[in-house]
């Protein structure tokens, strides 16, 4: 549903995108994810900030929490207890890392219509959550876990050894948060709230990254983060489970680690409760090609957790690392022992398998030269998942239902034909028992969110259709977008090309390559966006291309694992190959080609500029990795192995940006980094700059004081303005 192309007579009334449009978020879209609280009810925050409960079946809605109450504590978030008697209100949000933040929490009693006053929560809290049933509270404060049976009760302290930057209970340390769990929490309630499982991370021996935070004081302060870089000492993890009904009875019980995992360095990768007395833990060797899924049962007689070897399932990769970006998690069926899981089939495509006894006897549920991406929900008779099967476009996502109650199982695409032109990239959110679900379509047209009956798949109502955005875009000359593929030496390179509004194939245009290219990433997706590159095409007349080369995801293991132990080679080669193919198309001005990328993309763009091909006139690297020895162990070693002589040290050394400093002499290079980047440390750019200076190579640079990897706030505006000037100068475009 992009606005239709107009006739020339109307074109005078239309305008190009401006940089201001982008920086102001003028053309941002909304999505609607219901906050499900039952099979047929959900909560949603209304435009005027009331928290409203909607009942799909009765069609009724009422305000469960007034905006007056939200405002009284400046609440920015809320959470309803499952018994619906209490709501926590979250305020004083203070960001830490990607997912983590601290906040002040207030508990509002919905039955009495007032805040709970007795035994108030301490502040700031690192994580807080309700039990899945009733209104027990678990929270983490100063790296220790506390339990409340009721919000007004005094807390029970579960752990006592928590210490800043040393021992983390119930929350991950930096590397587990960013590279393994992708959450701010590391505690998990059992389905009925009987038990609470939690991880303890011991960072005592991890080397610390230290950097200055300049602030406003006379002396900068130093930020210290235990951060294991490649090959360094890793956190030591233990998993405990406590009975929350009688927490003081036997206290926390440790869950045993499978012997084959415990024999060397290892990671804990996820925990999935199956029933109140059965839990599934996933472990991973430090060399991340062996993963073990371990199902453990509660032994009432001993009050311990037993993980028999017969309930250990091994997942191993012989061609790369285990899993995609992460090892997939199991979705258990109603028998509480068998489960569904996505892993590579014999042809090297990630597919859904059903495991009843052993992995060897797994029944393959989906198959084909495409990939299953996510299992949303398993009910008694259906399995809902997403894949990129439809019409062989890897950058699409459709939702499918497989009937598992009948034999043979039948498959139905729920979304493929709903709004075919507008919607080709979906995600979904399901209510209890998949009675209803919301579909959120991200494009390629204007995003739309809809509500559906889980039995018939019938659309019930539109939740959000972005009408205001649609109207706002009516007089905007948006660029054209196309997604196509290049076939090169048995490799398929999918690309997205963003073309100026009055694109004419007979003319020559400057080309900007936008690259990320990290392992298991995907840039070429059928999604809607009005962003910086849209502006560059619309107003500045550039052609922008995004290319998914080797190492990218959802096209099979051959492409994905091609970069295993060899980062920085094929990703760069494939960007260069694509550029050559684009030149052959005849509309690219080969004297005006640039490349830019952020993070991993900054690494690839830097290497591409230093490739010595002479293809690129200029390029930008934002917060790039410059040497894999500087990046996090969990991420880096997954793809590169260890930086040791007997492993892969040689490629660690010859894949650095610094090693290619000389090659920057004939390109215009803009290097950008935030000084407070906790993720890709400023060290990376500092070392590039040092190498360039030592090689007497001229370059441009911009640092952002006290900014992290996201370069947010006012820095964002400055960044894109600065990059725009740089590119316009490079392409000889008038300001």
């Amino acid at each position: 549903l992009r606005p239709p192309r107009v006739h020339n007579s109307e074109e005078n009334t239309m305008r190009a995108l401006t940089l201001k449009d982008i920086l102001n978020g003028t053309f941002s879209y909304k999505t609607f994810f219901p906050n499900w609280i039952s099979g047929q009810e959900y909560l949603h925050q209304s435009a005027d900030n009331n928290i409203v409960l909607y009942n799909i079946e009765t069609g009724q809605s009422y305000t469960i929490l007034s905006n007056r109450t939200m405002k009284s504590v400046n609440a920015s978030n809320y959470g309803l207890s499952p018994d619906r008697q209490f709501v926590y209100l979250e305020s004083d949000y203070s960001k830490l890392w990607r997912y983590s933040y601290t906040a002040t929490y207030y508990i509002y009693d919905l039955s009495n219509g007032e805040f709970v006053r007795g035994n108030e929560l301490p502040r700031p809290i690192q994580y807080l959550c309700w039990s899945p049933v009733g209104s027990k509270l678990a929270y983490v404060y100063q790296n220790n876990i506390y339990l409340k049976q009721r919000p007004g009760d005094p807390p029970f302290q579960i752990t006592f050894n928590g210490r800043e930057n040393k021992i983390f209970n119930g929350i991950p340390d930096w590397v587990y948060e960013e590279e393994m769990l992708a959450t701010k929490y590391a505690l998990w309630w059992s389905p009925n709230g009987k038990f609470l499982a939690y991880a303890e991370f011991n960072d005592t021996d991890i080397p610390v990254i230290a950097y200055s935070y300049y602030g406003d004081e006379q002396y900068p302060r130093t930020i210290n983060i235990p951060y294991p870089k490649a090959g360094a000492k890793n956190p030591f993890v233990r998993i405990f489970i406590i009975d929350t009904t009688y927490p003081a009875y036997v206290g926390p019980q440790e869950v045993p680690v499978p012997a084959m995992i415990a024999s060397s360095d290892y990671y804990f990768s996820w925990l999935t409760w199956v029933t109140d007395e059965r839990v599934c833990l996933q472990w991973l060797k430090r060399v991340q090609n062996v993963s073990v899924l371990s199902i453990c049962d509660f032994r009432e007689d001993w009050q311990t957790w037993d993980c028999p070897k017969t309930q250990e399932h091994i997942e191993e990769s012989r061609t790369g690392w285990a899993g995609g970006f992460f090892v997939s998690t199991p979705v258990f069926s109603y028998d509480a022992i068998s489960y569904y899981k996505i892993f590579s089939d014999k042809d090297g495509y990630k597919h859904i398998h059903y495991i009843k006894d052993t992995v060897e006897n797994a029944i393959q549920i989906t198959s084909g030269k495409w990939e299953a991406i996510n299992i949303f929900r398993v009910t008694q008779d259906s399995l809902f998942y997403s894949s990129n099967e439809f019409e062989d476009y890897p950058g699409r996502r459709n939702i499918y239902r497989i009937s598992i109650g009948s034999y043979p199982p039948s498959k139905k695409c729920v979304t493929c034909h709903l709004r075919k032109e507008r919607c080709q990239y979906y995600t979904a959110s399901f209510s209890d028992y998949a009675k209803y679900y919301a579909l959120v379509c991200y494009g390629p047209g204007i995003p739309i969110s809809t509500l559906h009956d889980g039995r018939t798949d019938q659309e019930i109502k539109i939740l959000e259709e972005n009408k205001e955005l649609e109207n706002a875009l009516k007089n905007i000359q948006l660029p054209k977008e196309e997604i196509k593929k290049l076939e090169v030496d048995e490799i398929t390179l999918w690309y997205k090309m963003i073309l100026p509004p009055q694109f004419d194939r007979s003319k020559k245009y400057p080309l900007l390559i936008q690259v990320y290219g990290g392992p298991c990433s995907q840039s070429v997706r059928s999604v809607f966006a009005v962003n910086w590159i849209s502006y560059l095409a619309s107003k500045e007349g550039m052609v922008i291309a995004l290319v998914d080369g080797r190492g990218t995801a959802f096209q099979g293991d051959k492409l994905l694992y091609a970069v295993y132990r060899k980062l920085g080679v094929y990703e760069v080669e494939d960007q260069i190959t694509a550029v050559r193919k684009f030149i052959e198309m005849g509309f690219i001005d080969e004297k005006r080609i640039a490349i830019w990328g952020w993070s991993y993309g900054g690494y690839v763009s830097s290497l591409a500029l230093a490739s010595g091909t002479g293809l690129f006139k200029c390029g930008i690297a934002v917060a790039p990795v410059s040497s894999w020895e500087y990046y996090a162990s969990v991420y880096t070693e997954r793809f590169m192995g260890l930086p040791t002589k007997d492993d892969n040290l040689e490629h660690y050394k010859n894949s650095t940006v610094m090693a290619r400093a000389e090659y920057f002499r004939n390109v215009d290079y803009l290097l950008i980094h935030g000084t407070a980047d906790d993720n890709v440390h400023f060290q990376n750019s500092a070392q590039i700059a040092k190498a360039l200076v030592n090689a007497q190579v001229d370059f441009q640079a911009m640092w952002y004081s006290d900014q992290n990897h996201g370069l947010s706030g006012l820095s964002t505006n400055h960044l894109y303005t600065h990059m725009t000037h740089f590119l316009k100068q490079c392409f000889s475009l008038s300001d």
Epitope: L53, Y62, T63, I64, S66, R68, T69, S72, V73, R84, Q85, Y106, D109, L110, S111, N112, G113, E114, F115, V116, R117, G118, G152
Partner: antibody, heavy 124, light 113 residues
Framework: QVQLVQSGAEVKKPGASVKVSCKTS????????IHWVRQAPGQRLEWIGG????????NYNQKFKGRVTITVDTSASTAYMELSSLRSEDTAVYYC?????????????????WGQGTLVTVSS | DIVMTQSPDSLAVSLGERATINCKSS????????????LAWYQQKPGQPPKLLIF???TRESGVPDRFSGSGFGTDFTLTISSLQAEDVAVYYC?????????FGQGTKVEIK
């Protein structure tokens, strides 16, 4: 003038149930929670529970949990309190009272208006 | 649960004299965030429902004569009738509304000496 008018006196046998109503008027029903308090002969006032008319969520004194059910009919601006498995010790005057909803964090209100009371006698 | 204890159980005061009733709670009723004490005083005459006199320990409900005053904070509170009138004969209850369950004192009976 605000009014909370309760149903009439009841005589019940042990083991039976009683349902007392409290009809309110002359104020905005949804701005106040309704509470039930009882007073046995010569005893102190005892809080039984309360309900928020906005969402129908009750809160009970643990002592009565499982035996008491408090409900509300917002269209009739009426609250109900049902007590089951009656025993002789439940003989008391049962009062309903209103308490302003505290939207703000610093608020908190006492029970400012009470019903006239309903005598429930439990006798075999 | 917060236990409320009143003293004395009964009190006989001459007309026009001062009557003082004490109330002690088993835990503090002072809310640090707003420095308010969540304590109320009620008057109950025979055959009638309780009537709110004082809330937040010391704030008089509208329409309540100014001879009634409340004081105290934390765990110790006092209701004072500065000059007892004949219509003040009743049972007086203190009640905490700091946390649930709401609890009342056992009552103090005020009579004319």
């Amino acid at each position: 003038q605000v009014q909370l008018v309760q149903s009439g006196a009841e005589v019940k046998k042990p083991g039976a149930s009683v349902k007392v109503s409290c009809k309110t008027s002359r104020y905005t029903f949804t701005e106040y929670t309704i509470h039930w308090v009882r007073q046995a002969p010569g005893q102190r006032l005892e809080w039984i529970g309360g309900i928020n008319p906005n969402n129908g969520i009750p809160n009970y004194n643990q002592k009565f949990k499982g035996r008491v059910t408090i409900t509300v009919d917002t269209s009739a601006s009426t609250a109900y309190m049902e007590l089951s498995s009656l025993r002789s010790e439940d003989t008391a005057v049962y009062y309903c009272a209103r308490r302003r909803i505290a939207y703000g964090y610093d608020e908190g209100h006492a029970m400012d208006y009470w019903g006239q009371g309903t005598l429930v006698t439990v006798s075999s | 649960d917060i236990v409320m204890t009143q003293s004395p159980d009964s009190l006989a005061v001459s007309l026009g004299e001062r009557a003082t009733i004490n109330c002690k709670s088993s835990q503090s009723l002072l809310y640090s965030r707003n420095q308010k004490n969540y304590l109320a005083w009620y008057q109950q005459k025979p055959g009638q429902p309780p009537k709110l006199l004082i809330f937040w320990a010391s704030t008089r409900e509208s329409g309540v004569p100014d001879r009634f005053s409340g004081s105290g904070f934390g765990t110790d509170f006092t209701l004072t009738i500065s000059s007892l009138q004949a219509e003040d004969v009743a049972v007086y209850y203190c009640q905490q509304y700091f946390s649930y369950p709401l609890t009342f004192g056992q009552g103090t009976k005020v009579e004319i000496k």
